[in-house]
């Protein structure tokens, strides 16, 4: 569940989680 930065009614900012994958897995070893 990614959220986007914005302003809510109580003037708190929403942190943008959009820079990170929602269900990350470990990088494959090559």
């Amino acid at each position: 569940s990614e959220t986007t930065t914005g302003t809510s009614s109580n003037s708190s900012q929403s942190t943008s989680n959009s820079g990170l994958a929602p269900n990350p897995t470990n990088a494959t070893t090559k």
Epitope: S12, Q13, S14, T15, N17, S18, G19, P24, A27
Partner: antibody
Framework: EVQFVESGGGLVQPGGSLKLSCAAS????????MDWVRQASGKGLEWVAE??????????YYAESVKGRFTISRDDSKSTAYLQMNSLKTEDTAVYYC??????WGQGTLVTVSS | DIVMTQTPLSLSVTIGQPASISCKSS???????????LNWLLQKPGQSPKRLIY???KLDPGIPDRFSGSGSETDFTLKISRVEAEDVGIYYC?????????FGGGTKVEIK
């Protein structure tokens, strides 16, 4: 204004423990995925740990270098994230930043591990 | 782990001139949802890092539009169309597609 304020850093001997805190304000903390990132003096950035939000079951992730020694946690009622650091090593010496999923960042707290 | 390689290591730019930083990842950053989790951050001298761009090209709120990001898969670029004095610092690319999250080594931008 969004603020993340870290505290709890200091000087500790190898093998010792510290608990870092990150108090958030001006942000909907309960929605934030919280990370700790560290930076040794004059070096680059290294990700340490992450804890996600309630809809994501507060799942946690750790860097291999701290797995089994560090524990990330959060208290949404206090808008605070924590990093419990045990069995500290000299190579853990760094400024530790808390960040909301790499979006907002705190000013950092210095952890020095030395005998 | 995904290795993030930035070039150049440092960059000396005249105010008003453009600047470009390259970031290459050792594996594709394209995630299964079709999004690419490549971020750019700036750490100004004596300050904590600040994110400029996420998902390759999306500017964070309050970031001037002289900054732009592009690229796909493993090759990414940050461009500053006209460098200003306040742009000095160390720029980092960072991938958020696969654990562990990893950062590039940084590119130091200074003014000539």
């Amino acid at each position: 204004e969004v603020q993340f304020v870290e505290s709890g850093g200091g000087l500790v001997q190898p093998g010792g423990s510290l608990k870092l805190s990150c108090a958030a304000s001006g942000v909907t903390f309960s929605e934030a995925w919280m990370d700790w990132v560290r930076q040794a003096s004059g070096k680059g950035l290294e990700w340490v740990a992450e804890i996600r939000d309630k809809p994501n079951s507060y799942v946690t992730y750790y860097a291999e270098s701290v797995k089994g020694r560090f524990t990330i946690s959060r208290d949404d009622s206090k808008s605070t994230a924590y990093l419990q650091m045990n069995s500290l090593k000299t190579e853990d010496t760094a400024v530790y930043y808390c960040t909301g999923a790499m979006d907002y960042w705190g000013q950092g707290t210095l952890v020095t591990v030395s005998s | 782990d995904i290795v993030m390689t930035q070039t150049p290591l440092s960059l000396s730019v005249t105010i008003g001139q453009p600047a470009s930083i390259s970031c290459k990842s050792s594996q594709s950053l394209l995630y299964s949802n079709g999004k690419t989790y490549l971020n750019w951050l700036l750490q100004k001298p004596g300050q904590s890092p600040k994110r400029l761009i996420y998902q390759v090209s999306k500017l964070d709120p309050g970031i001037p539009d002289r900054f732009s990001g592009s690229g796909s898969e493993t090759d990414f670029t940050l461009k500053i169309s006209r460098v200003e004095a306040e742009d000095v610092g160390i720029y980092y690319c960072m991938q958020g597609s696969s654990l562990p999250w990893t950062f590039g080594g940084g590119t130091k931008v200074e003014i000539k």
